[in-house]
């Protein structure tokens, strides 16, 4: 049974041009995370593997950077940029769990930092 | 010890597909990616794709969208790569190799050689 | 596309000559968020599949050698063997794992003189 929990940033927004830290905490279980892939829609951005470290997508490696722990940086931002962000953590034994952050980027200098939520 | 062995040499005709097999023993399958390199005599090596097992995600060289379809069947260890619509221009080697982030193509396979011939 | 050209083409060597070989790429391949480059270096001797020998442009693959070393960093790099042994006579081919397409040079052709 699947009893965790994905903790993420939720909804933010950032400049254009700047840069923003995405990141999900897995708790209140006591599965071992052996793997987390950073999505963007479909397109994978970057693995974080227990064993073999980061790998960062060739696509991204000018705007993607690794961590802090298993978030992920983004940045030179665009409003391109603006969507659906998912950390998917492979576990062992519970399995999958996703959590999802939508980040919007804004032109002007009015952004701010939505508040955190919680997704079973 | 880490093995990729690839299905055998290949005479097919014209206009045919040909589907190339490349089984992995020795490492988790689903931690590395699977590239696949041609290789002709005077045009040296060139990156057809590559596909994450793990997750299925595939990449492309633009040049060979359309040619070559990569898949792979976690159940087995096996990657696949399937040419299709080949002409002369497809006859090469074409190795399978495996690849993760920072450590570049640590292991080959033998190469399989695709001749298209009428 | 990163382009990667290698010279020279071809290297005649004598056995327990020391030669170097070099990969020059269009663009950067260091990596800034852990200051680490992209390139790597095959050796394909005639009638193998090519050989992994440095990665992150001078870390040795476990097994080489260490008579194979590599250097350089940026746009500039270089394969030095410091004794060539006969089994070394191959082509040598540097490749950048950057960014999509993956791409590699040319080759370097290491022939006995």
């Known amino acids: 049974m699947m009893t965790g929990t994905i903790e993420t940033t939720g909804n933010i927004s950032a400049e254009k041009g700047g840069s923003i830290i995405l990141q999900c905490h897995l708790s209140s279980t006591t599965a071992q995370v052996t793997q987390v892939n950073w999505e963007q829609q479909d397109q994978l951005l970057a693995i974080c593997n227990a064993d073999l470290g980061w790998h960062i997508s060739p696509s991204f490696k000018d705007r993607v950077a690794p961590g802090p722990g298993l978030g992920l940086t983004l940045q030179s931002l665009t409003v391109n940029d603006t969507g659906e962000y998912f950390c998917i953590y492979h576990t062992y034994p519970d399995g999958t769990y996703t959590g999802r952050i939508f980040l919007e980027v804004l032109e002007s200098s009015v952004a701010e930092h939505g508040a955190r939520f919680q997704i079973p | 010890q880490v093995q990729l062995q690839q299905s055998g040499d290949e005479l097919v005709r014209p206009g045919t597909s040909v589907k190339v097999s490349c089984q992995a023993a020795g490492y988790t399958f689903t931690n590395y990616w699977i590239l696949w390199i041609k290789q002709r005599p005077r045009h040296g090596l060139e990156w057809i794709g590559d596909i994450y097992p793990g997750g299925h995600y595939t990449n492309y060289n633009e040049k060979f969208k359309g040619k070559a379809t990569l898949t792979a069947d976690t159940s087995s260890s096996t990657a696949y790569m399937q040419l299709n619509s080949l002409t002369s221009e497809d006859s090469a080697i074409y190795y399978c190799?495996?690849?993760?982030?920072?450590?570049?193509?640590?292991?080959w396979g033998q190469g399989t050689s695709v001749t298209v011939s009428s | 596309d990163i382009v990667m050209s290698q010279s020279p083409s071809s290297l005649p060597v004598s056995v327990g000559e020391k030669v170097t070989m070099s990969c020059k790429s269009s663009q950067s391949l260091l990596y800034n968020s852990n200051q680490k480059n992209y390139l790597a270096w095959y050796q394909q001797i005639p009638g193998q599949s090519p050989k992994l020998l440095i990665y992150w442009a001078s870390t040795g693959e476990s097994g080489v050698p260490d008579r194979f070393t590599g250097s350089g960093s940026g746009t500039d790099f270089t394969l030095t063997i410091s004794s060539v042994k006969a089994e070394d006579l191959a082509v040598y081919y540097c490749q950048q794992y950057y960014s999509y397409p993956f791409t590699f040079g040319s080759g370097t052709k290491l022939e006995i003189k």
């Open positions: 190799t495996r690849y993760y982030g920072p450590y570049a193509m640590d292991y």
